[in-house]
Amino acid sequence: GSSPRSGVLLRGCPTHCHCEPDGRMLLRVDCSDLGLSELPSNLSVFTSYLDLSMNNISQLLPNPLPSLRFLEELRLAGNALTYIPKGAFTGLYSLKVLMLQNNQLRHVPTEALQNLRSLQSLRLDANHISYVPPSCFSGLHSLRHLWLDDNALTEIPVQAFRSLSALQAMTLALNKIHHIPDYAFGNLSSLVVLHLHNNRIHSLGKKCFDGLHSLETLDLNYNNLDEFPTAIRTLSNLKELGFHSNNIRSIPEKAFVGNPSLITIHFYDNPIQFVGRSAFQHLPELRTLTLNGASQITEFPDLTGTANLESLTLTGAQISSLPQTVCNQLP
C-alpha cells in the first residue's frame, strides 16, 4: 500500500495534473497537454519530475519554480517559448534533464543555463536557433547529451563546444551547416555519437575530427560532400560510419586504414565510380559491404584482413575475373 508520506505528496499535486510517487519518496508530476498558458503554482517541493510539454506556455518568469531543489527532469517541449530569461532555472540544483525542444527559441538561453552543474541532457532541437554564443555551455560540466538538430545553424559553434569535455552524444542534424573546420570538436574527447546528417556540408577541414578519440558513430548522410571524407582517418574507434546520399565519386586507396574497428559503412546513393582496390583492407569487424554501380572497378577488391564479411554485393562493375584467393579471404 501507499505510505503516509505518499499521501502527503499527492496532496501537492496541481489541478488536472497526474501525479505519482517515484519510489524515492519524491513526486513525478505530469501536466502535459493540458492547454496551460503558465506554470502551475502549487508544486510540491518534493517534485523530482515535471512534465509541462505540449502546452501553450509562451514565457517563463525569472525563478518560476522556486524551491524545487529535488527536481531532476523538467520537460517544456512543445510550447511557445521564444525566450527564456536569466534565472528561469534558479535553484534547480539537481536538474539532470532539460527538454526545450519544439519551441520557438532563436538563441540558446545562455544566461538561464548558467550554473546547471548537474545537467546531463539538454534538448534544444526543433527550435529556430541560428546562433550559439561562445560561452553558452560554459557551466555545464556534467553535460552528456546535447540535441541541437532541426534548427537554423549555418556553422559549427566551435567555441561553444570547447567546454563540453564530458559530452558523449550530440546531434547537429537537420541544420544548414556547410563546412566543418579543423578541430571543430577538438575538446570532445568523450564523444561517442555525432550526428551531422541532413545538412549542406560540402567541405571538411583536413583535421575537422581531430580530438574525437572516443567516437564510435559518425553520421554524415544526406549532405553535399563531393569528396571522400578523409578526415575520418583520425577516428581509431569508429564503428559505424554513414555518408550515404552525398555526391562522392570515388573511394580512395586505403580509405579506412585509420578506422580498423568499423562494423558498418553506409555509402549508398553516391555516384561512386571508382573504388581503390585496397580501400576495404584490414577491417576485421566489417560485416556487410555493398558496392552498387561502381562502373570503374575492374579488379575485385583486395579484402586482406577483412575476414568476417557476411555479405558482399558488387553490381555494375567491370570485373572480368575473380582472384583465386577470394574464397580464402571470405569466411
Epitope: 561562445p134 556553422e155 559549427i156 566551435v158 567555441q159 570547447r162 573546420p181 579543423d182 578541430y183 571543430a184 577538438g186 575538446n187 583535421k207 581531430d210 580530438g211 578519440h213 578523409t230 582517418r233 583520425t234 577516428l235 581509431s236 574507434n237 586505403k254 586504414v257 585509420g258 578506422n259
Partner: antibody, heavy 118, light 111 residues
Framework: EVQLVQSGAEVKKPGASVKVSCKAS????????IEWVRQAPGQGLEWIGE????????DYNEKFKVRVTITRDTSTSTAYLELSSLRSEDTAVYYC???????????WGQGTLVTVSS | DIVMTQSPDSLAVSLGERATINCRAS??????????MHWYQQKPGQPPKLLIY???NLESGVPDRFSGSGSGTDFTLTISSLQAEDVAVYYC?????????FGQGTKVEIK
C-alpha cells in the same frame, strides 16, 4: 604516462642520409599526429612535417619536401624521420612531438642531435 | 608562410615581478573563434614544454602564474610573478596553416 623516446645522436657526412626514430608509448599511437621539429644550435624551432600513424597520412613543410620522408611502424608504435642529401646547415637537434589539443605539441621526445660534418 | 615575430628578444625581470612577452602573426590565425596560437617554454638542454594552447588555455600541470591572451594577430604571454625556475626561452607557434611556424624566441632572465 605518455612518452616519446628518440634514437641516439648521429654524425653524418654531407650528401648522406639520416633516419631518426621516435618510439611512442602511453597512448593510442594511431590516433594522434606525430610532428617533427628541428632546432639548429642556438637557433629557434622549425617545423618539418607530420604523420598520422593510423592512416599513414603525411604533410610536409615545402622547404623540406624533396629531402624528407616521414614514415611509421604501427606494430612498434614508432615514427621515423629520414632526411637525405644532408648539408652542414642540417646540423640540429631533431625533435618528435605529439599533436595534442587543437594541434598544440603537448609531449616531446628528448631530441636527437644530428651533426653533418666532412 | 605566416611569420611570427616575438618581442622583446630578451627580458630581465626581478623575482616576483610580472613578465610580458608579445607575439605578432603576419596574418590572422583565428578560425571559427579559435586562435590557433600556442606558447612553449624551453630550458637549456631540454625539449620545449607546452604552456598555453589556443591562445589562452592553460595546459594541465602548468602553474597558473602563466596566462595567455589575444586574438587575430596579436598575442601575449604573461608570467604574473616570476620564479627562478621560469628562466627559459619562450616560443609562440601557430598551426592555423601549413607550414606551422614559431616565433624566434624570447629569453627571460632574472634581473
Amino acid at each position: 604516462e605518455v612518452q616519446l623516446v628518440q634514437s641516439g645522436a648521429e654524425v653524418k657526412k654531407p650528401g648522406a642520409s639520416v633516419k631518426v626514430s621516435c618510439k611512442a608509448s602511453g597512448y593510442t599511437f594511431s590516433a594522434y599526429w606525430i610532428e617533427w621539429v628541428r632546432q639548429a644550435p642556438g637557433q629557434g624551432l622549425e617545423w618539418i612535417g607530420e604523420i598520422l600513424p593510423g592512416s599513414d597520412s603525411t604533410d610536409y613543410n615545402e622547404k623540406f619536401k624533396v629531402r624528407v620522408t616521414i614514415t611509421r611502424d604501427t606494430s612498434t608504435s614508432t615514427a621515423y624521420l629520414e632526411l637525405s642529401s644532408l648539408r652542414s646547415e642540417d646540423t640540429a637537434v631533431y625533435y618528435c612531438a605529439r599533436g595534442g589539443h587543437y594541434g598544440s605539441l603537448d609531449y616531446w621526445g628528448q631530441g636527437t642531435l644530428v651533426t653533418v660534418s666532412s | 608562410d605566416i611569420v611570427m615575430t616575438q618581442s622583446p628578444d630578451s627580458l630581465a625581470v626581478s623575482l616576483g615581478e610580472r613578465a610580458t612577452i608579445n607575439c605578432r602573426a603576419s596574418e590572422s590565425v583565428d578560425n571559427y573563434g579559435n586562435s590557433f596560437m600556442h606558447w612553449y617554454q624551453q630550458k637549456p638542454g631540454q625539449p620545449p614544454k607546452l604552456l598555453i594552447y589556443l591562445a589562452s588555455n592553460l595546459e594541465s600541470g602548468v602553474p597558473d602564474r602563466f596566462s595567455g591572451s589575444g586574438s587575430g594577430t596579436d598575442f601575449t604571454l604573461t608570467i604574473s610573478s616570476l620564479q627562478a625556475e621560469d628562466v627559459a626561452v619562450y616560443y609562440c607557434q601557430q598551426n592555423y596553416e601549413d607550414p606551422f611556424t614559431f616565433g624566434q624566441g624570447t629569453k627571460v632572465e632574472i634581473k
